[in-house]
């Protein structure tokens, strides 16, 4: 069944900047991806990029650069300047609506203690919900 | 509010087709996807397809593949599957539903039209 | 396909009794969705994502389950609770329907 996995980095030359890797395993193909931190979309989160594959993507502060990486996996640098930057412990989901079967949604966050430019290998997330 | 109207009943000879409409009303049309279920006398529900109307993409249950083909005109916000080759066993009513919404959260298939009833016989 | 097998097919409960309805997946869905019909009307979201309750739901409907095994309960069933109730999977294509269970009132 389908998975969404979620891998968040900080970078080494810029202690406050993150990247955010997000994937999806499935066979449906993905209509849209939505990126947001603070916690799901919809449900408290706030929207940092949204990935169309015909329509483009759009960015809000603090996100910096969004770009499909593969076909069913996209990344997104956060600027780390500015009140709005984030924070070790931030959580951050990513929900790829995939055709036919719906939304699947997944979020992680910092590794704890995790060296600046480390970070573990991206596993499957905790699926939050799939409409 | 969201209204789901589907057409009406339809009686037709074995081997004819049949297109139904679904027409779409108090939503954006392009926004939700739409899910067709059969549902014959007194059984239940069957998955035949989903269309995304934003982009036309179709999704098939296998088993109605060649059966049943769906299709949208964006510009009346209206949904339609034909049925071709009909028997007896395509005797059922034919629901429309709201499918996904891509942008947010929300519940599958919260909306669905009245049904079409398609009798087939001679 | 993933067969979805639903128990009991019909039964019957007194008001006030409580009520639940099982849904047993011939292979593991991530969640399972459910639906109220009754007769002459068209099938209704009743709960998504396994225990989210659908808009103006009675509080007295509650899901749960996971993996293989799912299931609707009613803590007090009351004369409009009397409907077939379907489960229903999309973690896998095609998305599948229980056969039904058809819940009357005594």
């Known amino acids: 069944t389908p998975e969404v996995w979620v891998q968040v980095r900080m970078e080494a030359t810029e202690l406050s900047s993150f990247t955010i890797r997000c994937g999806f395993l499935g066979s449906g193909s993905i209509s849209l991806v939505t990126v947001s931190w603070g916690g799901p979309n919809g449900a408290g989160g706030t929207t940092l990029a949204v990935l169309h594959p015909e329509r483009g993507i759009r960015q809000w502060a603090p996100a910096r650069q969004a770009r499909w990486e593969t076909q069913s996996s996209i990344s997104l640098i956060l600027e780390g300047s500015g009140a709005s930057s984030p924070c070790a412990n931030t959580t951050f989901c990513c929900k790829f609506a995939s055709f036919p079967e719906g939304s699947w949604e997944a979020c992680g966050s910092l590794p704890p203690s995790s060296d600046p430019g480390l970070s573990a290998p991206p596993t499957p997330a905790p699926i939050l919900r799939a409409d | 509010e969201v209204q789901l109207q589907e057409s009406g009943a339809e009686h037709v000879m074995p081997g004819a087709s049949v297109k139904m409409s679904c027409k779409a009303a108090?939503?954006?049309?392009?926004?939700?996807?739409m899910y067709w279920v059969k549902q014959r006398p007194g059984q239940g529900l069957e998955w035949i397809g989903t269309i995304d109307t934003s982009d036309h993409k179709t999704s098939y249950n296998q088993k109605f593949r060649g059966k049943a083909t769906l299709t949208v005109d964006e510009s009346s916000s209206t949904a339609y599957m034909q049925l071709s080759s009909l028997t007896s066993e395509d005797s059922a009513v034919y629901y429309c539903?709201?499918?996904?919404?891509?942008?947010?959260?929300?519940?599958?298939?919260?909306?669905w039209g009245q049904g079409t009833s398609v009798t087939v016989s001679s | 396909q993933n067969v979805l097998t639903q128990s009991p097919a019909i039964m019957s409960a007194s008001p006030g009794e409580k009520v639940t309805i099982t849904c047993s997946a011939g292979?593991?869905?991530?969640?399972m969705h459910w639906f109220q019909q009754k007769p002459g009307t068209s099938p209704k979201l009743w709960i998504y994502s396994t225990s989210n309750l659908a808009s103006g739901v009675p509080a007295r409907f509650s899901g749960s389950g996971s993996g293989t095994s799912y299931s609707l309960t009613i803590s007090r069933m009351e004369a409009e609770d009397a409907a077939t109730y379907y489960c229903?999977?999309?973690?896998?294509?095609?998305?599948?329907f229980g056969s039904g269970t058809k819940l009357e009132i005594k």
């Open positions: 108090g939503y954006t049309f392009t926004d939700y996807w």
């Open positions: 292979s593991s869905v991530n969640y």
């Open positions: 229903q999977q999309r973690s896998s294509l095609p998305f599948t």
């Open positions: 539903a709201r499918d996904f919404i891509i942008t947010v959260n929300y519940p599958v298939v919260d909306y």
